[in-house]
């Protein structure tokens, strides 16, 4: 888990500026699976590869996000890059987080959790990260993960690091993060829900 996100980022960072622009334009018209929304044009066109990766994963989750990215790359004539992306996403899987009942086998999440949908905004706007870490420690975060997030220098980088672990999380783990957010920054959760 997390491998697909890294593979998407790797592919997008290997595009030239012109290719990245073309990728975004194609993304605006590519056919989507039923039930998935399109990333708004205004936000999309100004994104760099890192922000676009985050947006793809938050809108479409890792599996479908990688598939969609590969389809667009293929449509651009970048067959080899598309093949590499799909090959990278089909290797390996992550361990279950600490303290939560793991499912018998991993399964694609058909519903988008609040945490996934608002990933970019949470990275940008959460300030009380230490409090979140304490709330999640031992339940969702291992000691190693806890220390890795704390080691980051800024709140956005802390949140970005925290979100690097979420692809391995199940629904209940995300619920615990959301609960912690409600308790520490309820105004932010309210604002995002309204949006």
């Amino acid at each position: 888990m997390g491998r697909a996100r890294d593979a998407i980022l790797d592919a997008l960072e290997n595009l030239t500026a012109e290719e990245l622009k073309k990728f975004k334009l194609k993304l605006l018209s590519v056919p989507l699976r039923e039930g998935y929304g399109r990333i708004p044009r205004g936000a999309l066109l100004s994104m760099d590869a890192l922000d676009l990766t985050d947006k793809l994963v938050s809108f479409y989750l890792e599996t479908y996000g990688a598939e969609l990215t590969a389809n667009v790359l293929r449509d651009m004539g970048l067959q080899e890059m598309a093949g590499q992306l799909q090959a990278a996403t089909h290797q390996g899987s992550g361990a279950a987080p600490a303290g939560i009942q793991a499912p018998p086998q991993s399964a694609a999440k058909p519903g988008l959790h609040f945490i996934d949908q608002h990933r970019a905004a949470l990275i940008a706007r959460v300030t009380n990260v230490e409090w979140l870490l304490d709330a999640l420690y031992g339940k969702v975060l291992t000691d190693e993960q806890y220390q890795a997030v704390r080691a980051e220098p800024t709140n956005p980088s802390k949140m970005r690091k925290l979100f690097s672990f979420t692809p391995a999380w199940n629904w209940t783990c995300k619920d615990l993060l959301l609960q912690a957010l409600r308790e520490s920054q309820s105004y932010l959760v309210e604002d995002l829900e309204r949006s």
Partner: antibody
Framework: QVQLVQSGAEVKKPGSSVKVSCKIS????????IHWVRQAPGQGLEWMGY????????MYNEKFQGRVTITADKSTSTAYMELSSLRSEDTAVYYC???????????????WGQGTLVTVSS | EIVLTQSPATLSLSPGERATLSCHAS??????LSWYQQKPGQAPRLLIY???NLHTGIPARFSGSGSGTDFTLTISSLEPEDFAVYYC?????????FGQGTKLEIK
């Protein structure tokens, strides 16, 4: 329309286990959490926990931790609640319930099963 | 866990009167509170969610308000079918908890 149909009433001995089922129809089973709430005779409502069938993960009320197991069978769109080490105070009506929506985990229960009476008696 | 305390335990009113039911939370739950109606032998029925949102199909005489720790369910003019037990429930944090209920009975 959304329907939650529960299994029939059960009479159990203290120390034994009970497994109550909740068959779901009218929506995609894997898209929403399913919760279990119980109500002892003449008493209030008590949340026991939930399962998210999309990934099989479950969360429990710590009061029941170790005694309750909530599972889901995607092939039959059925959720199950098993309670072990039964005692007389577990005599209650057990309800399965589905939230209005699960996206933001605001668990307001808009859809309920008809309830299953579990009587624990020696 | 968050404790919800409902008051009064029993409320005796006549049809046509206004009913005001209260729910107090032991800590701040923002607006994450819902209200249910339950009649004997039936499952609870969602009336209000997120403090003030009226659930689909619920008559407009029901309304909810409040935030933080104090919440109110108001029934503007009681109909005979409104006499039942009412529960509040918080969705702020786990475990989810319910109030002990207010019985609304005919005077």
């Amino acid at each position: 329309q959304v329907q939650l149909v529960q299994s029939g009433a059960e009479v159990k001995k203290p120390g034994s286990s009970v497994k109550v089922s909740c068959k779901i129809s009218g929506y995609s089973f894997t898209d929403q959490t399913i919760h279990w709430v119980r109500q002892a005779p003449g008493q209030g409502l008590e949340w026991m926990g939930y399962i998210y069938p999309g990934d099989g993960s479950a969360m429990y009320n710590e009061k029941f931790q170790g005694r309750v197991t909530i599972t889901a069978d995607k092939s039959t769109s059925t959720a199950y609640m098993e309670l072990s080490s039964l005692r007389s105070e577990d005599t209650a009506v057990y309800y399965c319930a589905r939230p209005l929506y699960s996206y933001a985990s605001y668990y307001w229960f808009a859809y309920w099963g008809q309830g299953t009476l579990v009587t624990v008696s020696s | 866990e968050i404790v919800l305390t409902q008051s009064p335990a029993t409320l005796s009113l006549s049809p046509g009167e206004r009913a005001t039911l209260s729910c107090h939370a032991s800590q701040n739950i923002n607006v994450y509170l819902s209200w249910y109606q339950q009649k004997p032998g039936q499952a609870p029925r969602l009336l209000i969610y997120k403090s003030s949102n009226l659930h689909t199909g619920i008559p407009a005489r029901f309304s909810g308000s409040g935030s933080g720790t104090d919440f109110t369910l108001t029934i503007s003019s009681l109909e005979p079918e409104d006499f039942a037990v009412y529960y509040c429930q918080q969705g702020q944090s786990y475990p989810l908890t319910f109030g002990q209920g207010t019985k609304l009975e005919i005077k």
